[in-house]
Interface confidence: medium
């Protein structure tokens, strides 16, 4: 769920969560691609 990174602003918090989610998705794709290429 959405708890995870503390900030004093909800808007900044959600933006950080969005970045975190995006990076996880990108890294996940890269990992899957590496496995696929092996």
């Amino acid at each position: 769920h959405s708890d995870g990174i503390f900030t004093d602003s909800y808007s900044r918090y959600r933006k950080q969560m969005a970045v975190k989610k995006y990076l996880a998705a990108v890294l996940g794709k890269r990992y899957k691609q590496r496995v696929k290429n092996k």
Epitope: H1, D3, S9, Y10, S11, R14, K15, M17, A18, K21
Partner: antibody
Framework: EVQLVESGGGLVQPGGSLRLSCAAS????????MSWVRQAPGKGLEWVAT????????WYPDSVKGRFTISRDNAKNSLYLQMNSLRAEDTAVYYC??????????????WGQGTTVTVSS | DIVLTQSPDSLAVSLGERATINCKAS??????????MTWYQQKPGQPPKLLIY???HLDSGIPDRFSGSGSGTDFTLTISSLQAEDVAVYYC?????????FGGGTKVEIK
């Protein structure tokens, strides 16, 4: 079907306290950040409080900070707003609202019907 | 705080005609390519209903006669062909910065 049902409103004297509740159903409550928004009679909308899905973090505008406390009980699928040191200007319909699951801060996709709080002597 | 100024305060439009509502922010509500602007519809005695998020994304179940546009400080909600059920007050809301703020509302009526 997503449903949000507020309760706990009523008439209270200035300086008094009131606790609002919002019963949620039809979705995975703990996965969603939640907010309270109010609307004074004949006026526009004002954001009052927000809490994260797990309840760890809360935010308020300066107009209610230190007087209002948002909380939740995920086991009971319930959202709360404890209001202390109430003032006449807190008179409003209070809506419970769910934040969208999108990565778009602040958009509220489901709202309850509201509960009326009247602060008057 | 970011102040949102809606215009006009009210407008009367004939059935089937276009209705345009503007929302001007006192500072940019953009961040990293996204516009943190939301539009709601509120009918008398009812809670607000989400129409558009991220300035231009139509929420699920909302008729495509509604559309949103804009970025930075200037945003527009358009109803391409006004229907009787569209009579309501429309609010813009920014969530780029705390505190979230709403515009004062625009009342849409049938001419």
């Amino acid at each position: 079907e997503v449903q949000l049902v507020e309760s706990g409103g009523g008439l209270v004297q200035p300086g008094g306290s009131l606790r609002l509740s919002c019963a949620a159903s039809g979705f995975a409550f703990n996965n969603y950040d939640m907010s309270w928004v109010r609307q004074a009679p004949g006026k526009g909308l004002e954001w009052v409080a927000t809490i994260t899905g797990g309840g760890s973090y809360t935010w308020y505008p300066d107009s209610v900070k230190g007087r209002f406390t948002i909380s939740r009980d995920n086991a009971k699928n319930s959202l709360y707003l404890q209001m202390n040191s109430l003032r006449a200007e807190d008179t409003a319909v209070y809506y419970c609202a769910r934040l969208t699951g999108y990565d778009q801060a602040g958009a509220m996709d489901y709202w309850g019907q509201g509960t009326t709080v009247t602060v008057s002597s | 705080d970011i102040v949102l100024t809606q215009s006009p305060d009210s407008l009367a439009v004939s059935l089937g005609e276009r209705a345009t509502i503007n929302c001007k922010a006192s500072q940019s509500v953009d961040y990293d390519g996204d516009s943190y602007m939301t539009w709601y519809q509120q009918k008398p005695g009812q809670p607000p209903k989400l129409l558009i998020y991220a300035a231009s994304h139509l929420d699920s179940g909302i008729p495509d006669r509604f559309s949103g546009s804009g970025s930075g400080t200037d945003f527009t909600l358009t109803i391409s062909s006004l229907q009787a059920e569209d009579v309501a007050v429309y609010y813009c809301q920014q969530s780029n910065e705390d505190p979230w703020t709403f515009g004062g509302g625009t009342k849409v009526e049938i001419k």
